[in-house]
Interface confidence: low
């Protein structure tokens, strides 16, 4: 057993261009809070999959109001550590998700509104009992700086918190087969305490609280002899006494699922189906309450102050499920018209409209050329909800304000080289091609394919295009 601890140092704009706007304003003051989700191993799981190692929610940070005109600074953070207790061994490799949430404190109908500002994820190796590990993660233009560690709760010690230490009974030595507990040399490694009731003759354990059966015995406490009459599930070596195949050790032997959980084998390991009120890899975490942070994605937990009472997750907009673990894809309804891009901001839907359209759902078609002037003799052309200028020769850009580089469009075909000229461009054709844009191949016999070269110009000479 032990605790994973996360310390957030700063959350603010990352270095470089494109600093994000402050998430809070004078009209909408807000405050931040964080959620951490831990999973064992290095699996790249979906954000919504269960936090099998545990989850925690921070307190709310101080209320923050943006100073008008100021760039987003590092935002004020909640006090204290985020702590995720774990009951089993620390797995050594783990995946994490850290979410930064904004709670808007304006006049919201039905209470405060939450929206996800940033989500970072990673996979790390970490030994319990080690020093704080520092990390920087980026999500969009935001940057999160944090430290984390895993520490064992006494009497557990070791990199996985599986060794137990007890004070020495004699000053000079530990008991037979037991080593001193480094770095606590005045304590001794304690023998493993198996699951209560585990048969001392037919069961053993490699981790505290488990009960694994010797061959020929089964049941949660290894007290049930394996039936040799039917021999229906041959998986192991032949028994010399019965001539029958005794099942060899399988992942569900000894039932690794605690608290009445049922075990089913998977191709690689096992899976526990836990009764209500228990969760975790082996159903070892009991009495889920709001203190365990069971609501994902910023869901608000209500009730469940004691292990016997249920909790209810009130999900923020955009999420559903008993633990707010499922994301609602509200953009699948295609609410934005005229090709607008749908953005689900969690607390609201937004439509980013194509040029020439406006309105909350991009429903208004604008007069594309109204009030639009094309410079330097260009003319405005409407069409497809977008305004564009047809520019006079020598000018380009959206409003014909830029002097055009006539060679930018690579007008010379077949590898011809383009030269900008005050009155247009000139193409110097590669051998074997001719024409104003080097578009015509020269036949091997010297005759050109449409049209003939003007007098005085040999194939390969620069061709002026006006």
């Amino acid at each position: 057993a032990g605790v994973f601890e996360l310390q957030i140092h700063s959350f603010g704009p990352g270095p470089g261009p494109g600093a994000p706007r402050s998430p809070c304003s004078a009209r909408l003051p807000c405050r931040l809070f964080f959620r951490v989700c831990l999973k064992p191993g290095l699996s790249e799981e979906a954000a919504e999959s269960p936090c099998a190692l545990g989850a925690a929610l921070s307190a709310r940070g101080p209320v923050y109001t943006e100073q008008p005109g100021a760039p987003a600074p590092d935002l004020p953070l909640p006090d204290g550590l985020l702590q995720v207790p774990f009951r089993d061994a620390w797995p050594g490799t783990f995946s994490f998700i850290i979410e930064t949430w904004r709670e808007e404190l304006g006049d919201q109908i039905g209470g405060p509104a939450w929206s996800l500002l940033a989500r970072v994820a990673g996979r790390r190796r970490l030994a319990a009992g080690g020093p704080w590990a520092r990390d920087i993660q980026r999500a969009g233009a935001w940057e999160l700086r944090f430290s984390y560690r895993a520490r064992c709760e006494p009497p557990a010690v070791g990199t996985a918190c599986t060794r137990l230490c007890r004070p020495r009974s004699a000053p000079s030595r530990c008991g037979p087969g037991l080593r001193p507990c480094a770095p606590l040399e005045d304590e001794c490694e304690a023998p493993l305490v198996c699951r209560a009731g585990c048969s001392p003759e037919h069961g053993f354990c490699e981790q505290p609280g488990e009960c694994r059966c010797l061959e020929g015995w089964t049941g949660p406490l290894c007290t049930v002899p394996v039936s040799t009459s039917s021999c229906l599930s041959p998986r192991g070596p032949s028994s010399a006494t019965t001539g029958c195949l005794v099942p060899g050790p399988g992942p569900c032997d000894g039932n690794p699922c605690a608290n009445g959980g049922s075990c089913s084998e998977t191709p690689r390991s096992f899976e526990c189906t836990c009764p209500r009120g228990f969760y975790g890899l082996r159903c070892e975490v009991s009495g889920v309450t709001c203190a365990d942070g069971p609501c994902f994605n910023g869901g608000l937990c209500v009730g469940g102050a004691d292990p016997d009472s249920a909790y209810i997750c009130h999900c923020p907009p955009g999420f559903q499920g008993s633990n707010c673990e499922k994301r609602v894809d509200r953009c699948s309804l295609q609410p934005c018209r005229n090709g607008g891009l749908c953005l689900d901001l969690g607390h609201a839907l937004r439509c980013r409209c194509r040029a020439g359209f406006a309105g909350p759902r991009c429903e208004h078609d604008l007069d594309d050329c109204a009030g639009r002037a094309c410079a330097n003799g260009g003319t405005c052309v409407e069409g497809g909800g977008a305004h564009r200028c047809s520019c006079a020769l020598g000018f380009g850009g959206r409003d014909c304000r830029e002097r055009a580089d006539p060679c930018a469009a690579r007008p010379c075909a077949h590898g011809g080289r383009c030269y900008a000229h005050f009155s247009g461009l000139v193409c110097a054709c590669a051998p074997g091609y001719m024409g104003a844009r080097c578009e015509f191949p020269v036949h091997p016999d010297g005759a050109s394919a449409l049209p003939a070269a003007p007098p005085g110009l040999r194939p390969g000479d620069p061709q002026r295009y006006l």
């Epitope: 990352g14 470089g16 290095l42 790249e44 490799t93 940033a118 989500r119 970072v120 994820a121 990673g122 996979r123 790390r124 190796r125 990390d135 920087i136 993660q137 980026r138 999500a139 969009g140």
Partner: nanobody, 124 residues
């Protein structure tokens, strides 16, 4: 530390194909952004394509529809499949890793590990 070794470069006619590989070794368990970059003589280094730990990809406009970036996590290898090659694709191609990348974004200015590069030459 992460070591990156590129391979698969060479000379090819315009319109041909090449597949570049980048094998990572060392401290590779972290969640990475990985990218391909290229540098032609006398030109700035430019990003070609990148891929985030969640598998999402992005491409430079000049290679969209012709190049495909992918990775094989089991082999710790990044790939760049280059089809319909053009003479202007001639460059030294480098693969790079951003150890901090997450949340679906890669930052071309912050890649902290680079390979030695592999030369791609496309002739017309």
């Amino acid at each position: 530390q992460v070591q990156l070794v590129e391979s698969g470069g060479g000379s090819v006619q315009a319109g041909g194909s090449l597949r570049l590989s980048c094998t990572a070794s060392g401290d590779t368990y972290r969640s990475y952004c990985m990218g391909w970059f290229r540098k032609a003589p006398g030109k700035e280094r430019e990003g070609v394509a990148d891929i985030v730990s969640d598998g999402s990809t992005s491409y430079a406009d000049s290679v969209k529809g012709r190049f495909t970036i992918s990775k094989d996590n089991a082999k710790n290898t990044l790939y760049l499949q280059m089809n319909s090659l053009k003479p202007e694709d001639t460059a030294m191609y480098y693969c790079a890793v951003d150890r901090g990348g997450s949340g679906g974004y890669c930052y071309t200015g912050r890649y902290d590990y680079w390979g030695q590069g592999t030369q791609v030459t496309v002739s017309s």
